[in-house]
């Protein structure tokens, strides 16, 4: 069956049961996610707006899926397996009496079970497992996953130390003047340049030596870490940010509602699963999307891909490629291409590299 193909998963509590204090609901749901993050490499974070991977809903009767609730007793809750849209969402029957203790139905215990489904687990035949299909109260202070639950979830995601195989596992701030520093994405935003790396970005204001480091989540709480590509259309005050097969639109530094959207809406074929880098050229009103060793050209006026693409990066950008990490447009004639710790100033009118720099040369290193 399906699993989440990432380790950072967001959840949002859509609405709150009147049976409990909001803080108690928040706490029960947070602790339920923690049960699973303790035994896997998964990390869960709560968001309050925007589209989360897992939506927690309290509802009664018919509520927008095929599985209407049945009043008090019977079905307590249900959850959908990993996926987009309704995928991952957990629904709790509002006709139950939800509690923090043994009376009524314990929200924490039910949530642990449902989140198991949200992560891709089916039911267990072991009566001691939290994934056993029937609800039974156990002391929440001494609650533990059974060996069967742990075996099941780790067969899908591995154990917690798999985290260490991820780059920068503690997500500590990268050293700005490390000569090996590379960037995930770079774009101008007005007179500033944003450099993205892991969950951080540096802000460089043109011609000023001072730069500041920030958490992406501090500026845009609904955006993920690990932005992979970015570009700006300054005339529209728009910035597009890409991760995996999704993109977000930022207008006037504010995230637009109804995002993320699929990158395939730009017209990419289905085999394109992520964008490495992107840059908008206001002279031609075209955006260049770099994917592996190829690039596409997108007409921002007509909102469609130009015919004849993709083309090889090495064929049309002399000295650049075969793959790039990031690119931005500056001074009306240059693209700045980033490949690992190296950066190339490329004159797109002369169609050649005019300067080779370190990626962090913008920071006075």
């Amino acid at each position: 069956g399906p699993v989440w193909r990432k380790h950072y998963i967001t959840y949002r509590i859509n609405n709150y049961t009147p049976d409990m204090n909001r803080e108690d609901v928040d706490y029960a749901i947070r602790k339920a996610f923690q049960v699973w993050s303790n035994v896997t490499p998964l990390k869960f974070s709560k968001i309050n707006t925007g589209m989360a991977d897992i939506l927690v809903v309290f509802a009664r009767g018919a509520h927008g899926d095929f599985h209407a609730f049945d009043g008090k007793g019977g079905i307590l809750a249900h959850a959908f397996g990993p996926g987009s849209g309704i995928g991952g969402d957990a629904h709790f029957d509002e006709d139950e009496f939800w509690t923090t203790h043994s009376g009524g139905t314990n929200l924490f215990l039910t949530a642990v079970h449902e989140i198991g489904h949200s992560l891709g687990l089916g039911h267990s035949s072991d009566p001691k497992a939290v994934m056993f299909p029937t609800y039974k109260y156990v002391d929440i202070n001494t609650f533990r996953l059974s060996a069967d639950d742990i075996r099941g979830i780790q067969s899908l995601y591995g154990d917690p130390k798999e985290n260490q195989r991820l780059p920068n596992p503690d997500n500590s701030e990268p050293a700005l003047c490390d000569p090996n520093l590379s960037f995930d994405a770079v774009t101008t935003v007005g007179n500033k340049i944003f450099f993205f790396k892991d969950r951080f970005f540096w802000l460089k204001v043109s011609e000023r030596p001072k730069t500041s480091v920030n958490l992406i989540s501090s500026l845009w709480p609904t955006l993920p870490s690990g932005i992979e590509a970015a570009y700006e259309i300054e005339a529209r005050n728009q910035v597009f940010l890409f991760k995996d097969d999704k993109y977000w639109l930022i207008s006037n530094l504010r995230p637009e509602p109804n995002y993320p959207k699929s990158i395939h809406s730009f017209g990419f074929p289905n085999f394109v699963k992520k964008i490495d880098a992107a840059v908008f050229n206001p002279r031609f009103y075209r955006t260049y999307f770099f994917v592996d060793n190829q690039y596409w050209r997108y007409d921002e006026r007509r909102q469609m891909m130009d015919p004849g693409y993709p083309k090889l990066i090495t064929k049309n950008f002399q000295g650049i490629g075969p793959k790039i990490d990031a690119v931005f447009y500056s001074k009306n004639k240059y693209y700045y291409f980033f490949q690992g710790s190296n950066q190339f100033e490329y004159d797109f009118l002369l169609q050649r590299i005019t300067k080779t720099l370190k990626s962090n040369s913008w920071f006075g290193c």
């Epitope: 069956g1 899926d65 959850a79 959908f80 309704i86």
Partner: antibody, heavy 122, light 103 residues
């Protein structure tokens, strides 16, 4: 490439029976919920029936309950709709559609077959 | 039972126009609403799922919004290939459809 191909439609008299099939390819059929949706000539779409990945859970629209039976054979990657006690108002193009993976149905129909026409008339 | 009311039932517009179709549920369906496009003689195609997520391969001129009971499908600049019938849907309930015709 995901493909769904319906067959088994045709002309049948009121009260008669028909069995529709939908052959699936290009995806792991046994993971997905599957559904039948119909469209009477010149009319809108009407959901008919759905079945869980294992076949253990089935759902029907009130208009067909007790007369139609949905089933699947995961070894053959095929979905079926057995239609009994057919009425004139069952005349429609019948589409099979793929839903999501997992224990519950979202009713998110991301792939559809081309449809097969069922005509109930004397 | 949940009911879906789609409006308008038909709409005439020109290439380049911005068009909005609405769908209303008689009770909250959160963001569990999908939009489909159907051309004559063809099967429906999924355009938007979960109220606002664009299905893979669908042009970015299509967008969806809304949550709870009120939803909209917007086509920012109509293209000739967009003249078709559009349906909203949640679970087993489809809206009655909106036929988009050339003015």
């Amino acid at each position: 490439e995901v493909q769904l191909l319906e067959s088994g439609g045709g002309l049948v008299q009121p009260g008669g029976s028909l069995r529709l099939s939908c052959a699936a390819s290009g995806f792991t059929f046994s993971w997905y919920w599957m559904h039948w949706v119909r469209q009477a000539p010149g009319k809108g779409l009407e959901w008919v029936s759905g079945i869980s990945p294992s076949g253990g859970m089935t759902m029907y629209a009130d208009s067909v309950k007790g007369r139609f039976t949905i089933s699947r054979d995961n070894s053959k990657n095929t979905l079926y709709l057995q239609m009994n006690s057919l009425r004139a108002e069952d005349t429609a193009v019948y589409y099979c559609a793929r839903d999501i993976v997992g224990p519950y149905s979202a009713g998110l129909f991301d792939y559809w077959g081309r449809g097969t026409l069922v005509t109930v008339s004397s | 039972d949940i009911q879906m009311t789609q409006s308008p039932s038909s709409l005439s517009a020109s290439v380049g126009d911005r068009v909005t179709i609405t769908c209303r549920a008689n009770q909250s369906i959160y963001t569990y609403l999908n939009w489909y496009q159907q051309k004559p003689g063809k099967a429906p195609e999924l355009l938007i799922y979960a109220a606002s997520s664009l299905q893979s391969g669908v042009p970015s001129r299509f967008s969806g919004s809304g949550s709870g009971t009120d939803f909209t499908l917007t086509i920012s600049s109509l293209q000739p290939e967009d003249f078709a019938t559009y349906y909203c849907q949640q679970a087993g309930i489809f809206g009655q459809g909106t036929k988009l015709e050339i003015k």
